[in-house]
């Protein structure tokens, strides 16, 4: 059973003896509380009681899962990859039935020679990982294969992989134009039919840190954003300090609500602070403003 709990008031005392009085829950949003047995576990926002404490769901934390974190862990993959589906026609090998069987000695030998040839062709491409033959068919030998590319994740990974796929196209076009049969003989490791070279399809790893950030932020998706530090993406709310998007609350504390980040201003023995960024100080005795 779920219960809606009344809003309580939280008082925060700062190191200078100041206090902040603010409703701890956004009044406009009913908060659900998980109840286990007869005992109210007070785990809000979908959190559950594990017998000792509340286990909170992202993006919540706190004793009762009532607070919103300032940053959410997002983990981009270490490496990203692309797969190119290519077809080339090898003219220096005649097709035989044994090549249809991937476990035959003939297939294994063809695979080895073809791999060696392609490793030579793509040797200058740092993203190149290898080739994988998917099918061999008559004509002399039509080789359907995948070219595999991989690179470290950076914000520009798509550009890096797109560039690598372009170089693959250039190199395979070059080799299949140059290594051709003369007088029914081939002087290269393999010879090709220039017109048989086709790129069928290119698949690139899809990873969008912004999308992951928005998904994990759930109902706060509009207020969390991605900023990069040392090529690594961080999913942060404006309440996280040290980023371009960080909110400066001056004499106050940043708190997330479903309407975004807001500053909760402090009251000290001598001043009370107001304004959107808690930058307007009013002296209690003299009623004098400092900006």
């Amino acid at each position: 059973p779920l219960a809606t709990i009344p809003v309580s008031t939280t008082s925060l005392t700062s190191s200078e003896g100041s206090t902040i009085s603010t409703p701890s829950v956004d009044i406009s949003t009913p908060v659900t509380t998980s109840i286990v047995g007869d005992q109210c576990s007070r785990c809000k926002n979908g959190g559950f009681w594990d017998g000792l404490k509340c286990q909170c769901l992202t993006p919540y934390y706190g004793e009762s899962c009532e607070e919103v974190v300032n940053s959410i862990d997002i983990a981009p993959p270490e490496t990203v990859s692309a797969q190119m589906e290519l077809t080339v026609t090898v003219t220096s090998v005649k097709f035989t039935d044994e090549l249809k069987n991937h476990s035959s000695q003939e297939f294994r030998e063809f695979n080895k020679t073809f791999t060696e040839q392609m490793n030579i062709v793509y040797s200058g491409i740092p993203e190149y990982v290898g080739v994988n033959i998917t099918n061999l068919r008559l004509g002399s030998v039509v080789v359907e294969h995948d070219v595999l590319l991989r690179t470290k994740y950076t914000p520009e990974y798509k550009t890096a992989l797109d560039n690598a796929t372009e170089v693959v196209k250039q190199k395979i076009t070059k080799v299949t134009t140059e290594q051709i049969m003369t007088n029914d003989n081939c002087s290269a490791l393999m010879c090709f039919n220039t017109t048989g070279t086709q790129v069928q399809n290119i698949t690139v790893t899809q990873y969008d840190p912004v999308e992951e950030c928005r998904q994990k932020a759930e109902e706060y998706e509009d207020y969390f954003l991605v900023e990069y530090r040392d090529q690594k993406p961080y999913c942060i709310s404006p309440c996280e300090s040290g980023f371009n998007a960080s909110k400066n609350c001056n004499h106050g504390k940043c708190q997330m609500s479903q309407n975004g980040a807001r500053c909760l201003c402090v009251t000290t023995e001598t001043h009370w602070y107001s304004g959107e960024d808690c930058n307007q100080g009013t002296q209690k005795s003299h009623h004098h403003h400092h900006h």
Epitope: S92, K94, E98, T113, D184
Partner: nanobody, 123 residues
Framework: DVQLVESGGGLVQPGGSLRLSCAAS????????MAWFRQAPGKEREGVAF???????SYAESVKGRFTISRDNALSSLYLQMNSLRAEDTAVYYC?????????????????WGQGTMVTVSS
């Protein structure tokens, strides 16, 4: 395991003849491609003669009309009949094989090799 063993090399006078043999064990003799390569001192290995499973043959320009390649599938053997030998034919002759029907003279395309037999043409 494929094993190729050459024999028949030796010293011969210019204009003379020699017949090289290559015994192939563990190799399906009715399939693929068999070839003779040679390597003269200080030179690269070069293709001399080639024969496919269907009997198709091809020769290096320098030996055309003088050398003849043949294979005996029943005996799993490859032969090279060399006539009108010249001093420039002096080299180590290697038997090579591939399970594939190849039309390439590139040595790197052939995975199986013998140890070689020396042919010296000298007066």
């Amino acid at each position: 395991d494929v094993q190729l063993v050459e024999s028949g090399g030796g010293l011969v006078q210019p204009g003379g003849s020699l017949r090289l043999s290559c015994a192939a064990s563990g190799f399906p003799s009715s399939r693929g491609t068999m070839a003779w390569f040679r390597q003269a001192p200080g030179k690269e290995r070069e293709g001399v003669a080639f024969i496919n499973s269907d009997g198709r043959t091809s020769y290096a320009e320098s030996v055309k009309g003088r050398f003849t390649i043949s294979r005996d599938n029943a005996l799993s053997s490859l032969y090279l009949q060399m006539n009108s030998l010249r001093a420039e034919d002096t080299a180590v002759y290697y038997c090579a094989a591939s399970l594939l029907y190849l039309m390439t003279v590139n040595a790197a395309a052939y995975p199986y090799w013998g140890q070689g037999t020396m042919v010296t043409v000298s007066s």
